[in-house]
């Protein structure tokens, strides 16, 4: 015998209290697949979270983070404080990158400057706290007497893609 609940589409639930008829999900709840016996409570984007997509009867709300914070975890389960370019977030707050490391975004960690010599290249542009080095040609490609290192480009607002 076919389960009568299998006829209930997304956005409804199979209501045992009403002889297994398909009832619409109550306000602030949803069912994203058919044949559900209950509707799930909608996620609420509160505090540092803000609503990116409203809840509907067939899909959950989606949250992102208020300005100054960025998403972490699957489905933006957490919001983490932004730092400035040239910094990383530690337990004690935002700290400048140590010499030899950089962070060109508002999130994430300070990473070591690229070691150009690993690729047999020279340093074309020095690194800063905000920027990686730019590797240039191999030292053998440089003309005699040519200076190989350019001063770093001025720091600028990083491109970062909140996630």
């Amino acid at each position: 015998l076919q389960d009568p609940c299998s006829n209930c589409p997304a956005g409804t639930f199979c209501d045992n209290n009403r002889n297994q008829i398909c009832s619409p999900c109550p306000p602030n709840s949803f069912s994203s697949a058919g044949g559900q016996r209950t509707c799930d409570i909608c996620r609420q984007c509160k505090g540092v979270f803000r609503t990116r997509k409203e809840c509907s009867s067939t899909s959950n709300a989606e949250c992102d983070c208020t300005p100054g914070f960025h998403c972490l975890g699957a489905g933006c389960s957490m919001c983490e404080q932004d730092c400035k370019q040239g910094q990383e977030l530690t337990k004690k707050g935002c700290k400048d990158c140590c010499f030899g490391t950089f962070n060109d975004q508002k999130r994430g960690i300070c990473r070591p400057w690229t070691n150009c010599s690993l690729d047999g290249k020279s340093v074309l542009v020095n690194g800063t706290k905000e920027r990686d080095v730019v590797c240039g040609p191999s030292p053998a490609d440089l003309s005699p007497g040519a200076s190989s290192v350019t001063p770093p480009a001025p720091a600028r607002e990083p491109g970062h893609s909140p996630q």
Partner: antibody, heavy 119, light 107 residues
């Protein structure tokens, strides 16, 4: 020599997912960013996102944030990009690329993987 | 996002001609401007990085110049093997963005 070898062409139905691979060789995989770039038929190039295989740190173009998931497997020196909920506008050639010394230009490119979405 | 305005979208020139392509970002990108060549078979190659630096192995007829919001790519003497589409790309700010491309044909 540095090589990025991508998986073969795929034909998928709307709503399906596809996972494209990019196997790197000839360099230390964990030390360079791998980027993914889209080229729709007759169109220009669009940056989708990148990954730093050492710690799997990713950046995404907001436009592709809900479409693409980029991962990397250090043990096989392979990067992956999964595209979900495929639609006809996802029909394109997808390239993986490596950065040049630092993550601001792309010095090596894979041969491209054609993904066709058709019912 | 930074918009990259590349011109012309196509051009036809003769072997030996000097060819110039321009790229104008919508905001200052310092020197983080790169040029790529895409052959008809889809193969993509980096030619110029950091505005003017010729990638190792690339012929010296290719060159680049500019800074900030105005960049130029030049082929000093066009060769038959230069038939391709050329793209500029900014590496200053995420998301990285490309120009729409210049399709180069031989007269």
């Amino acid at each position: 020599q540095v090589q990025l070898v991508q998986s073969g062409a795929e034909v998928k139905k709307p709503g399906a997912s596809v996972k494209v691979s990019c196997k790197a060789s000839g360099y230390t995989f964990t030390s360079y960013w791998i980027n993914w770039v889209k080229q729709a038929p007759g169109q220009g190039l669009e940056w989708i996102g990148n990954i730093y295989p050492s710690d799997s740190y990713t950046n995404y173009n907001q436009k592709f944030k809900d479409k693409a998931t980029i991962t990397a497997d250090k043990s096989t020196s392979t990067a992956y990009m999964e595209l979900s909920s495929l639609r006809s506008e996802d029909t394109a050639v997808y390239y993986c690329t490596r950065d040049y010394g630092s993550s601001y230009s792309f010095d090596y490119w894979g041969q491209g993987t054609t993904v066709t979405v058709s019912s | 996002d930074i918009q990259m305005t590349q011109s012309p979208s196509s051009l036809s020139a003769s072997v030996g001609d000097r060819v110039t392509i321009t790229c104008r970002p919508s905001q200052d990108i310092s020197n983080y401007l790169n040029w790529y060549q895409q052959k008809p078979d889809g193969t993509v190659k980096l030619l110029i990085y950091y505005t003017s630096r010729l990638r190792s192995g690339v012929p010296s007829r290719f060159s680049g110049s500019g800074s900030g919001t105005d960049f130029t790519f030049t082929i000093s003497s066009l060769q038959p093997e230069d038939i391709a589409t050329y793209f500029c790309q900014q590496g200053d700010t995420l998301p990285y963005t490309f120009g729409q491309g210049t399709k180069l044909e031989i007269k």
